[in-house]
């Protein structure tokens, strides 16, 4: 037989020879980092047909690293469920806690003994510093110095010195998040007042008032013979401007001799995208169609309408 087989976990006792006689036996032992568990044999014999009898290193078990308890408020999860060297230990903290230290430890061989690559981490409670103070406003629990995970504060605005109140821009409530950061930026308090929206040839149908503050919502409709250019609903935004802008009521053009298919009262037009139809060929209508608010009717191609004078 030629040299006996080699194994990951087992080594030959003594030096290998270039060849072995039939019936000659070689013995193995578990390598460093492994230990023998009976009853499997760790020897082989040179057989009559010049091959070694079957032998495996299954009897050699890996040394194990010391036991690791779950960290307080967390978990130690052995990868592959084993503490054997060559494997990892993963650490996870419960919700509301964060990891201080290594997230993964490795079970490594030091000489003949398996040891962890470092100290197990700890799970600390998520804490937030007080949320930001805001101008012209305050938040609840302003006297608290440390906030725990999911603790919430609510902002409110101070009474305004002048005739117009401060409006709260943004979310009023924020909470201490999982990486010790507040869930969002603090809101702001400022006077927001939009100009009185005037639409000629139209009228306001809801949201009546003398003053229009933050988030005030107004709806319009056009007089008979006019169609709405823009949105029928506008909202007073944080910059004291209407969003979308105040619409216009434009006159419906009279019909001409070449009648297109009849449409109902009005079709609202949008001014967001140009359509390739603006370059369409063929007969063109010479009037603007009446505006319709009925659902189900297509909006006329804006490009076509824009190109008609």
């Amino acid at each position: 037989c030629e040299e006996p087989p080699t194994f990951e976990a087992m080594e030959l006792i003594g030096k290998p020879k270039p060849y072995y006689e039939i019936g000659e036996r070689v013995d193995y032992k578990c390598k460093k980092g492994y230990f023998y568990i009976p009853p499997l044999a760790t020897h082989t014999i040179c057989d009559r047909n010049h091959t070694w009898l079957p032998v495996s290193d299954d009897a050699c078990y890996r040394e194990t690293c010391p036991y690791i308890r779950d960290p307080l408020n967390g978990q130690a999860v052995p990868a592959n469920g084993t503490y054997e060297f060559g494997y990892q230990m993963h650490f996870i903290c419960n919700e509301g806690y964060y990891l201080i230290g290594e997230e993964i430890l490795y079970c490594e061989l030091k000489g003949s003994v398996a040891i962890w690559s470092g100290k197990p981490p700890i799970c600390e409670k998520v804490l937030c510093t007080p949320p930001p103070k805001i101008k012209n406003g305050k938040h609840t629990f302003s006297e608290v110095e440390v906030f725990e995970y999911l603790d919430a504060v609510t902002y409110s605005c101070d009474p305004a010195p002048g005739p117009d109140p401060f409006s709260l821009i943004g979310e009023s409530t924020i909470y201490c998040g999982d990486n010790s950061v507040w869930s969002r930026a603090a809101p702001e308090c400022k006077v927001v007042k939009c100009r009185f929206p005037v639409v000629e040839n139209g009228k306001q149908i809801s949201g009546f008032g003398k003053k229009f503050y933050y988030k005030a919502t107004v709806m319009f409709e056009c007089d008979k013979g006019f169609y709405l250019d823009g949105s029928d609903t506008i909202v007073c935004d944080s910059n004291s401007t209407w969003d979308p802008p105040v619409p216009k009521c434009l006159k419906v053009l009279p019909p001409s001799s070449t009648k297109p298919p009849a449409l109902s009262h009005s079709v609202s037009t949008s001014s967001t995208t140009k359509s390739p139809a603006s370059s369409a060929s063929g007969p063109r209508p010479t009037y603007k169609p009446p505006v319709s608010n009925y659902p189900g009717y297509p909006k006329p191609e804006e490009g076509i309408l824009d190109s008609l004078d």
């Epitope: 980092g33 023998y36 568990i37 009976p38 036991y67 690791i68 052995p78 000489g111 003949s112 197990p120």
Partner: antibody
Framework: QVQLVESGGGVVQPGRSLRLSCAAS????????MHWVRQAPGKGLEWLSF????????YYADSVKGRFTISRDNSKNTLYLQMNSLRAEDTAVYWC?????????????WGQGTLVTVSS | SSELTQDPAVSVALGQTVRITCQGD??????VSWFQQKPGQAPVFVMY???NRPSGISERFSGSSSGNTASLIITGAQAEDEADYYC????????????FGGGTKLTVL
């Protein structure tokens, strides 16, 4: 055939010292870790100490840490346990046991034991 | 107190099956070794893990494990099985220390 023979036991006064020896034969001593275990009269087994094949790694049970020292002489195929500041509660049969690998492994072979009596 | 807990005494009728148990946190992660000790003799290694027996140990001996409990099972107990049985594994302190259970005295009736 693996053989482990302990010696050095006897009667000793509290506070005194004693050195136990364990002579090994029948295996390549220098490639195996070794353990010491004891058993007080009428009590259970107590693991005491471990030394790796080359003597680099040593571990001790809390009950003997700082008082007992494990060592080995691979040239003499002998394991030792130096016991200092002995107490009455150290009275026990002491065994050396072979590990089944270079490291701690399992305790696959034991000696016949040596009795240590700590008494004034 | 041992970190591996065993029942102090268990009895079994001759020829019946008996289960000797060992409990401990570390057994969720490690196999256990079992030792048999007869009066006045050194302990003898009889089992590791589920079914790893050294040569010379009867096939009546087997092992099992579930969660934090390991068991040594003797099927068809014989009079010569009467002895103290100790489990042995790592301790759960996060060190390299080993620990024995308190031992179980098996009586064959």
């Amino acid at each position: 055939q693996v053989q482990l023979v302990e010696s050095g036991g006897g009667v000793v006064q509290p506070g005194r010292s004693l050195r136990l020896s364990c002579a090994a034969s029948g295996f390549t001593f220098s490639t195996y870790g070794m353990h010491w275990v004891r058993q007080a009269p009428g009590k259970g087994l107590e693991w005491l100490s471990f030394i790796s094949y080359d003597g680099d790694e040593k571990y001790y049970a809390d009950s003997v840490k700082g008082r007992f020292t494990i060592s080995r002489d691979n040239s003499k195929n002998t394991l030792y346990l130096q016991m200092n500041s002995l107490r009455a509660e150290d009275t026990a049969v002491y065994w050396c046991a072979k590990a089944s690998g270079y490291g701690m492994g399992i305790l696959d072979y034991w000696g016949q034991g040596t009795l240590v009596t700590v008494s004034s | 107190s041992s970190e591996l807990t065993q029942d102090p005494a268990v009895s079994v009728a001759l020829g019946q099956t008996v289960r000797i148990t060992c409990q401990g946190d570390s057994l969720r992660s490690y196999y256990v070794s079992w030792f048999q000790q007869k009066p006045g003799q050194a302990p003898v290694f009889v089992m590791y893990g589920q079914n790893n027996r050294p040569s010379g140990i009867s096939e009546r001996f087997s092992g099992s494990s579930s969660g934090n409990t390991a068991s040594l099972i003797i099927t068809g107990a014989q009079a010569e099985d009467e002895a103290d049985y100790y489990c042995h594994s790592r301790d759960s302190s996060g060190t390299h220390l080993r620990v024995f259970g308190g031992g179980t005295k098996l009586t064959v009736l």
